[in-house]
Amino acid sequence: MAVTACQGLGFVVSLIGIAGIIAATCMDQWSTQDLYNNPVTAVFNYQGLWRSCVRESSGFTECRGYFTLLGLPAMLQAVRALMIVGIVLGAIGLLVSIFALKCIRIGSMEDSAKANMTLTSGIMFIVSGLCAIAGVSVFANMLVTNFWMSTANMYTGMGGMVQTVQTRYTFGAALFVGWVAGGLTLIGGVMMCIACRGLAPEETNYKAVSYHASGHSVAYKPGGFKASTGFGSNTKNKKIYDGGARTEDEVQSYPSKHDYV
């Protein structure tokens, strides 16, 4: 029972985590304009992995995709790759873990096969979570570096008369979503790996022991009077019921190019 609960919980936690990783990857707020120097700006900039956006105080939001691949920073490409790898691994892990769930019966699948599948999905979730955490952390590090660089040359004056303020960017909501989601996927993966240990059938062979009683030549098999109780042919002791795998349609909404707030 505890094994089933651990496996089920691991699956649910991982599912939430992977949904979060997908959401974070699609989000536009990976970096947002730092408002420390101008908290009442009429133009607010924010950037994602795929496009950069500008929200005017008028309510108009304009987003422009990064239509170049070669012109993008290598770090951004690396973050994209890490997040995509994380999503792909997580998605495969989810698929594998659905079939590995103890509460779902597929044909005459052995517990050993389910244990292996649980372990495989668990490892996939762990790697997926690590990819997401790594991707988000690389991006955060890039932001911190750029932040202090732009702070160093925040104002460049033209003869001390005209000020040109350089836009600084700070952590966006997507980073926090990514960190939490990556952590959840990681925890879910660990739970799956723990569940795997409980799912693996015991390898101990219980050999029949002969007890010679005086005057009788009767061999007693451990397990009592019924051969099928406990240790007999029915060693699996399966809990059987049909658990339907549910799939939820996730709709990712994007701000339109003419989005009045």
Epitope: V40, N45, S57, S58, Y260, V261
Partner: antibody
């Protein structure tokens, strides 16, 4: 057709109060940020206050902060400017304006004159 | 606050002439996020409210004659009227649309001979 009509102007004594209204029609009022802008022959155009479509954020010019309050009633398509502790320098023609692309004002009302004098 | 300076204050021209109105800001109005300049031009005729001519420094508002052209970037901007007509006699204002408080220039009064 987009229309903005201001009302509530008039002669006020220094230290007195006045509430200006701006009735909007011809567009989805709840979808736009709105402003009050004033004009005097001496100072020219001066931005006074801004209110976003959902009433937050709200911004004021330093000259009116703490004395003026901008508000809106979306179901009634009306913008307000509550003016208190009025000074002679607040004497101006007050316009309401609709916020548009590029943080510009694409439609203005005809204005309402507020005169602060003893 | 961003200070907007317009020059000249007064301008008298002949109909059909090309006119250039200047506007300078104390701080750059160029937004790095979308590479747009947040500067707006308005025209105000006597007894009327201001009318929007150009936003984003060079985008002409619908219904505005194409003789009106906005240009410039960063801190220096110009409004050009290619061939002045009698109905262009008005006050022209530039506005900082980049940060609050939204500030206006002192205006340029265009007169016709």
């Amino acid at each position: 057709d987009v229309q903005l009509v201001e009302s509530g102007g008039g002669l006020v004594q220094p230290g007195g109060s006045r509430k200006l209204s701006c009735a909007a029609s011809g567009f989805t009022f709840s979808g736009f940020g709105m402003h009050w802008i004033r004009q005097t022959p001496e100072k020219g155009l001066e931005w006074v206050a801004y209110i976003s479509s959902d009433s937050r954020p709200i911004y004021y010019a330093d000259t009116v902060k703490g004395r003026f309050t901008i508000s809106r009633d979306n179901p009634k398509n009306t913008l307000f400017l509550q003016m208190t502790s009025l000074r002679s320098e607040d004497t101006a023609m007050y316009f309401c304006g609709r916020f548009y692309y590029g943080n510009s004002f694409d439609h203005w009302g005809q204005g309402t004159l507020v005169t602060v004098s003893a | 606050d961003i200070v907007m300076t317009q020059s000249p204050s007064f301008l008298t021209v002949t109909a059909g002439e090309k006119v250039t109105l200047s506007c300078r800001s104390s701080q750059s109005l160029l937004n790095s996020g979308n590479q747009r300049n947040y500067l707006t031009w308005y025209q105000q005729k006597p007894g009327q409210p201001p009318k929007l001519l150009i936003y984003w420094a060079s985008t002409r508002e619908s219904g505005v004659p194409d003789r009106f052209t906005g240009s410039g970037s960063g801190t220096d901007f110009t409004l050009t009227i290619s061939s002045v007509q009698a109905e262009d006699r008005a006050l022209y204002y530039c506005q900082n649309a980049y940060s609050f408080p939204l500030t206006f220039g002192t205006g340029t009064k265009l007169e016709l001979r």
